[in-house]
Interface confidence: low
């Protein structure tokens, strides 16, 4: 078992997008028995890296208020794609 904390992170989409990669989804579970969406890689100098709060391994719970539970990976990707310029992420950090 492990402790988690939640945080709201507001990012402004940069020239390279949001600057991180995701894994997970109901069709390709990244964590055993968990179909959630996780941050797999943060691009150096991207929007997320410059903000500094998002970490590899964080679970993304929602995008602009839209829940990421029980989504196919592709559907989650499309949510990020269409999230607009200002993107609000609800994330769960593992402590």
């Amino acid at each position: 078992d492990y402790l988690v904390t939640e945080e709201e992170i507001n990012l402004t989409r940069g020239p390279s997008g949001l600057g991180f990669n995701i894994v997970g989804g109901t069709d390709q579970q990244y964590v055993s028995n968990d179909s959630g969406i996780y941050v797999s890689e943060i691009d150096e100098n991207g929007a997320a890296a410059l903000d500094g709060r998002l970490q590899e391994g964080d679970k993304i719970l929602s995008v602009n208020g839209q829940d990421l539970k029980n989504l196919l990976h592709q559907d989650a990707v499309d949510l990020f794609r269409n999230a607009g310029y200002a993107v609000s992420l609800r994330v769960q950090h593992r402590l």
């Epitope: 020239p15 997008g17 894994v23 890689e41 691009d43 100098n45 592709q74 990707v77 990020f80």
Partner: nanobody, 126 residues
Framework: HVQLVESGGGLVQAGGSLRLSCAAA????????MGWFRQAPGKEREFVSA????????YYADSVKGRFTISRDNAKNTVHLQMNSLKPEDTAVYYC???????????????????WGQGTQVTVSE
């Protein structure tokens, strides 16, 4: 919107090398992850290689690992695919593709890519 133009294809003997280039116009290629795919006659388009926007992360199909190298020059809006030790089974039309949002699990999926070039023919003879 981004337009992609491939070049560098041609006819080469088995064991030889080619260097493909993909030039991006319309927006800087550094806005995008870039991939190379190929399609042989009568076969589905298949993933070859991809590179993230910064060039830090590269990905390869098992069939080309150790022989092909992908790189990018964001200053020139160009992505390169250096192909060494070519085999007849590498014969195909090679396509460059651009993807706005990068997602590690789907580099291999053509449906993930937003923009495509017209392709360049690579023929490897025995």
């Amino acid at each position: 919107h981004v337009q992609l133009v491939e070049s560098g294809g041609g006819l080469v003997q088995a064991g030889g090398s080619l260097r493909l280039s993909c030039a991006a116009a319309g927006r800087t290629s550094s806005d995008y992850a870039m991939g190379w795919f190929r399609q042989a006659p009568g076969k589905e388009r298949e993933f070859v290689s991809a590179i993230n926007w910064s060039g830090i992360s590269t990905y390869y199909a098992d069939s080309v690992k150790g022989r092909f190298t992908i790189s990018r020059d964001n200053a020139k809006n160009t992505v390169h695919l250096q192909m060494n030790s070519l085999k007849p089974e590498d014969t195909a039309v090679y396509y460059c593709a651009a993807e706005k949002l990068e997602s590690l699990r789907n580099w291999h999926d053509p449906l993930m890519y937003d923009y495509w070039g017209q392709g360049t023919q690579v023929t490897v003879s025995e």
